[in-house]
C-alpha cells in the first residue's frame, strides 16, 4: 500500500514537471522524455483496483509492430523473397493452426512448447510450432514428391522469451525447402549459399555458419559408447557448447544424464573439433569413426557439399563443427547453424549478443512420417530467424539515430491560398489514377508552411502546389522538400516529372 | 536479488582512456533508467551520466561531456562508461547505480563501485 | 545547476536520541528530493524518496519531510548501525546533484 502511494506521488510530481516544461516551452527532446517517464510510471502504476481490474497489454511474449518497425520489417522481408526468388522458389501459405497429431512426435523435447487451442468441435488442435512441419504434411497430403517453395509466416512457441534478444512466442520464420530425388549435396549447397547470400545482403556483420551431419553425430555416439536411447539427450547436452565451456556439458552429461565419465571424455575428444574440408579429411582417416557406416556416409557427403560450397565461393564463410547438434528431431543428414561473429556495433560497444541467425539441414524421413505407406520424400531447408534479424537492425538504426521513411508517398498536394480544396482533391485523384502514390492534407485550408512541414516529418520529397495563378497559367509549382527549388510543369506533364524524379517507371505494367 | 558489480578501474595517465563495466542481475535491465555516479577520495558525491532503458535518452555532466560516453547492452544486461582524455579530477570510485522506479533519478540500488586513478 | 546545501555538516549524538538534518535547495524542486545513507568504503544506500516516502526495507525510525526549498531527516532513536554520513540530493533536474553530506558521529 505505501508503495502505491509513494508511486502516486512520483506521477503526480512527474505530471506536474511535464506540465512545467511544457508552460517554459522547453526543447522538444526533455519534454518527449519526461512525458516517456511519466508513462512509465503510470504502467508501473497500473490500474486503480477500483476503477478498473483489466491491465491493457499484448500477451507475454509478443508485441505490436510499430510503423517504423513494419518498414524495417518490410526492408527485410524483400530482401529474403527477392534471394528466394532468385533461386526459382514458388510461395506457399499453410493453416496457422493444425491438427494436435500432425504435430505431435516432430519435436522431441519441444514439444512441450506447443500451444495447444481449446476443443473447436471436436478437433485437438495446436498451431503451428515451425513452417518445416506443416511443409512435411502439405507435402504428404498432396502426394508431392517434387518441389522448391519458401513460406513467410508466423509460428508459435510456448517459450519463456528474453524479448530483448529477439525471443518471442510470437514470431516469423522465413523457410525455404528443397523436396526431391536428387544427386548428393547439390540442393544442400543451394540452401547454404542461400544463406550466405541472405546474411551478407542484410548486412548485419560478419558471419559464419556452422555446418555438421546428424549420421556423424549418431556414428560418433555409437563408437563412443552412447546407448541408441541416449542419442538425443545427450545430443542436446553437445549442443549448448556454443555457449557453456565443455567443464559444464561434460557435467551436465555425467551427473544429470548419467553418461560414463570416460564415454564423455571420447565425445569431447571430437566435439571440440572444428575446421574445414580438411577436418572432414582428417575424420575420414580416423581409425574409429571411418569404421562406423553412419559416419562414412555423413563425412563423404561433407567432403562433396565443401566441393560444390567451394564452387559456390562461399567455403570461407563455412566451418565444420562437431558440437553443433540442432535440437530438432527430424534432421536426418546435414546440419548448419549461422551465427553473428559480432554485430556492427560502434566503436568501443560491447556487440549484441543475439546467437543463431539462420539454421537449418536435411529431413528425409519427415514427410514418410506423414504417408500411409511411409514413402519417403528428402527434403533439405532453412529458416532465417527474422525476429533476430529486425532486433539487430532496429538497434543498428538506434545507434545511428538514422531516420526509417514509413510511407512510401512521393508528392503532396499543397495549396498556396484559401479556397482551393476542390482543386487539390481534383489533382490527387489524377496522380492516384496513374499510379503516383500522393497525399493531401485533410483541411481546408491548410497554411503552406504546415505542409512542407509534413513533408519534411514524413519524409516526402516532393509538393506540388496549386495556386491561383499556376491555375489560370495551366501549371503545378513542383517544388523539392530537400534542395527548396521549385519549378513550373505544365499539368498534363506532371505525372511523367514525377516519376522521372522519384525514378519509378513511366508505365504501370 | 538486484545486484550491480563494476569493473575495467585501475592506474592510468593523465590524457588516457578507461571502459568502465556494471553487470547487472536480478531484474529486467532493459526497463531502467541506468547511472554511473563518482566520488572523489573523501569528497562527495557527483552524477555523471544517464541512459534510458530504449538507449533513447542520455545525458552528462558538464565536467565530463565530450570526454565520457555512456552506452549499454540490454542483451548482456550491462551498463558502460568510456572515459577518454583523462584528467586527475577525474580520479574517483565509479559507482554504477539503478533508478527507482525504472525512471526516477534517485538511486535505489548501486555497486560496490570500482576505483578509477588518474596520475602520471 | 540546483545547489543543496546539508546543515549541519557534522553531527555527535548518543543511542536512543533523536537526530535532524537539514537540506536546502538553491530553487524550489518540489518533492524530488532523496537521503541516502553511506558508510565508510561502502556503497550510499537510498532511504527516503520523493522527499517522505520510506524506501522498502529501510527502517520506520527514518522519516523525511519538506517541499520546496526546505526538507529534513529525522532519525526518531538513533541505534548504532546509524551512525555514518547522510546525503541529500535532487531528481527535479540533471545535472542532479547531492548535498555535501553531514556526518553524524557517536557522542
Known amino acids: 500500500m505505501a508503495e502505491r502511494a509513494a508511486l502516486e506521488e512520483l506521477v503526480k510530481l512527474q505530471g506536474e514537471r511535464v506540465r512545467g516544461l511544457k508552460q517554459q516551452k522547453a526543447s522538444a527532446e526533455l519534454i518527449e522524455e519526461e512525458v516517456a517517464k511519466l508513462l512509465k510510471l503510470k504502467a508501473q502504476l497500473g490500474p486503480d483496483e477500483s476503477k478498473q481490474k483489466f491491465v491493457l497489454k499484448t500477451p507475454k511474449g509478443t508485441r505490436d509492430y510499430s510503423p517504423r518497425q513494419m518498414a524495417v520489417r518490410e526492408k527485410v522481408f524483400d530482401v529474403i523473397i527477392r534471394c528466394f526468388k532468385r533461386h526459382g522458389a514458388e510461395v506457399i501459405d499453410t493453416p496457422v493452426f493444425e491438427l494436435k497429431e500432425t504435430l505431435m512426435g516432430k519435436y522431441g523435447e519441444d514439444s512441450k512448447l506447443i500451444y495447444d487451442l481449446k476443443d473447436q468441435g471436436g478437433e485437438l488442435l495446436s498451431l503451428r510450432y515451425d513452417l518445416t512441419v506443416p511443409f512435411a504434411r502439405y507435402l504428404a497430403m498432396n502426394k508431392l514428391t517434387n518441389i522448391k517453395r519458401y513460406h513467410i509466416a508466423k509460428v508459435y512457441r510456448r517459450d519463456n522469451p528474453a524479448m530483448t534478444r529477439g525471443r518471442y512466442r510470437e514470431f516469423y520464420q522465413c523457410d525455404f525447402d528443397i523436396a526431391g530425388n536428387f544427386d548428393p549435396m547439390i540442393p544442400d549447397a543451394e540452401c547454404l549459399k542461400i544463406m550466405c547470400e541472405i546474411l551478407s545482403s542484410l548486412q548485419i556483420g560478419d558471419f559464419l555458419v556452422k555446418v555438421n551431419d546428424r549420421r556423424i553425430l549418431d556414428g560418433m555416439f555409437a563408437i563412443c559408447g552412447v546407448s541408441d536411447s541416449k542419442f538425443r539427450t545427450i545430443c542436446s547436452s553437445v549442443d549448448k557448447l556454443d555457449k557453456v565451456s565443455w567443464e559444464e556439458v561434460k557435467n551436465e552429461m555425467v551427473g544429470e544424464k548419467g553418461l560414463a565419465p570416460e564415454v564423455a571424455d571420447r565425445i569431447g575428444d571430437y566435439v571440440q573439433q572444428h575446421g574445414g574440408v580438411s577436418l572432414v579429411e582428417q575424420l575420414l582417416q580416423d581409425p574409429k569413426l571411418s569404421q562406423n557406416k553412419q559416419a562414412l556416409e555423413g563425412l563423404g557427403d561433407l567432403k562433396l557439399l565443401f566441393e560444390y560450397l567451394t564452387l559456390f565461393g562461399i567455403d570461407d564463410k563455412i566451418s565444420f563443427d562437431l558440437s553443433l547438434a540442432r535440437g530438432l528431431d527430424y534432421y536426418t543428414g546435414v546440419i548448419y547453424e549461422a551465427v553473428l561473429l559480432q554485430t556492427p556495433a560502434q566503436a568501443g560497444e560491447e556487440p549484441l549478443g543475439v546467437g543463431s541467425v539462420a539454421a537449418g539441414g536435411r529431413y528425409d524421413g519427415l514427410v514418410g512420417m506423414f504417408d500411409p505407406k511411409g514413402r519417403k520424400v528428402p527434403c533439405v531447408g532453412l529458416s532465417i530467424g527474422v525476429e533476430r534479424i529486425f532486433s539487430i537492425v532496429e538497434q543498428r538504426l538506434e545507434a545511428l539515430e538514422e531516420k526509417i521513411r514509413t510511407t512510401e508517398t512521393q508528392v503532396l498536394v499543397a495549396s498556396a491560398q484559401k479556397k482551393l480544396l476542390e482543386e487539390r482533391l481534383k489533382l490527387v485523384s489524377e496522380l492516384w489514377d496513374a499510379g503516383i502514390k500522393a497525399e493531401l492534407l485533410y483541411k481546408k485550408n491548410p497554411k503552406l508552411l504546415n505542409q512542407l512541414q509534413y513533408c519534411e516529418e514524413a519524409g516526402i520529397p516532393l509538393v506540388a502546389i496549386i495556386g491561383e495563378q499556376e491555375l489560370k497559367d495551366g501549371v503545378i509549382k513542383l517544388r523539392s522538400v530537400t534542395s527548396r527549388e521549385e519549378v513550373d510543369v505544365r499539368r498534363e506533364d506532371l505525372v511523367e516529372e514525377i516519376k522521372r524524379r522519384t525514378g519509378q517507371p513511366l508505365c504501370i505494367c | 536479488q538486484v545486484q550491480l558489480v563494476e569493473s575495467g578501474g585501475g592506474l592510468v595517465k593523465p590524457g588516457g582512456s578507461l571502459r568502465l563495466s556494471c553487470a547487472a542481475s536480478?531484474?529486467?535491465?532493459?526497463?531502467?533508467?541506468m547511472t554511473w555516479i563518482r566520488q572523489a577520495p573523501g569528497k562527495g558525491l557527483e552524477w555523471v551520466s544517464y541512459i534510458s532503458g530504449s538507449f533513447a535518452y542520455t545525458d552528462y555532466a558538464d565536467s565530463v561531456k565530450g570526454r565520457f560516453t555512456i552506452s549499454r547492452d540490454n542483451a548482456k544486461n550491462s551498463l558502460y562508461l568510456q572515459m577518454n582524455s583523462l584528467r586527475d579530477e577525474d580520479t574517483a570510485v565509479y559507482f554504477c547505480?539503478?533508478?527507482?522506479?525504472?525512471?526516477?533519478?534517485?538511486?535505489?540500488?548501486w555497486g560496490q563501485g570500482t576505483l578509477v586513478t588518474v596520475s602520471s | 545547476d540546483i545547489q543543496m546545501t546539508q546543515s549541519p555538516s557534522s553531527v555527535s549524538a548518543s543511542v536512543g536520541d533523536r537526530v535532524t538534518i537539514t537540506c536546502r535547495a538553491s530553487?524550489?524542486?518540489?518533492?524530488?528530493l532523496a537521503w541516502y545513507q553511506q558508510k565508510p568504503g561502502r556503497a550510499p544506500k537510498l532511504l527516503i524518496f520523493a522527499a517522505s516516502s520510506l524506501q522498502s526495507g529501510v527502517p520506520s525510525r527514518f522519516s523525511g519531510s519538506g517541499s520546496g526549498t526546505h526538507f529534513t531527516l529525522t532519525i526518531s532513536s538513533l541505534q548504532p548501525e546509524d551512525f555514518a554520513t547522510y546525503y541529500c540530493q535532487q531528481a527535479k533536474s540533471f545535472p542532479y546533484t547531492f548535498g555535501q553530506g553531514t556526518k553524524l558521529e557517536i557522542k
Open positions: 536480478g531484474f529486467t535491465f532493459s526497463d531502467y533508467y
Open positions: 547505480a539503478r533508478y527507482v522506479y525504472q525512471v526516477v533519478a534517485i538511486g535505489d540500488y
Open positions: 530553487q524550489g524542486i518540489s518533492s524530488w
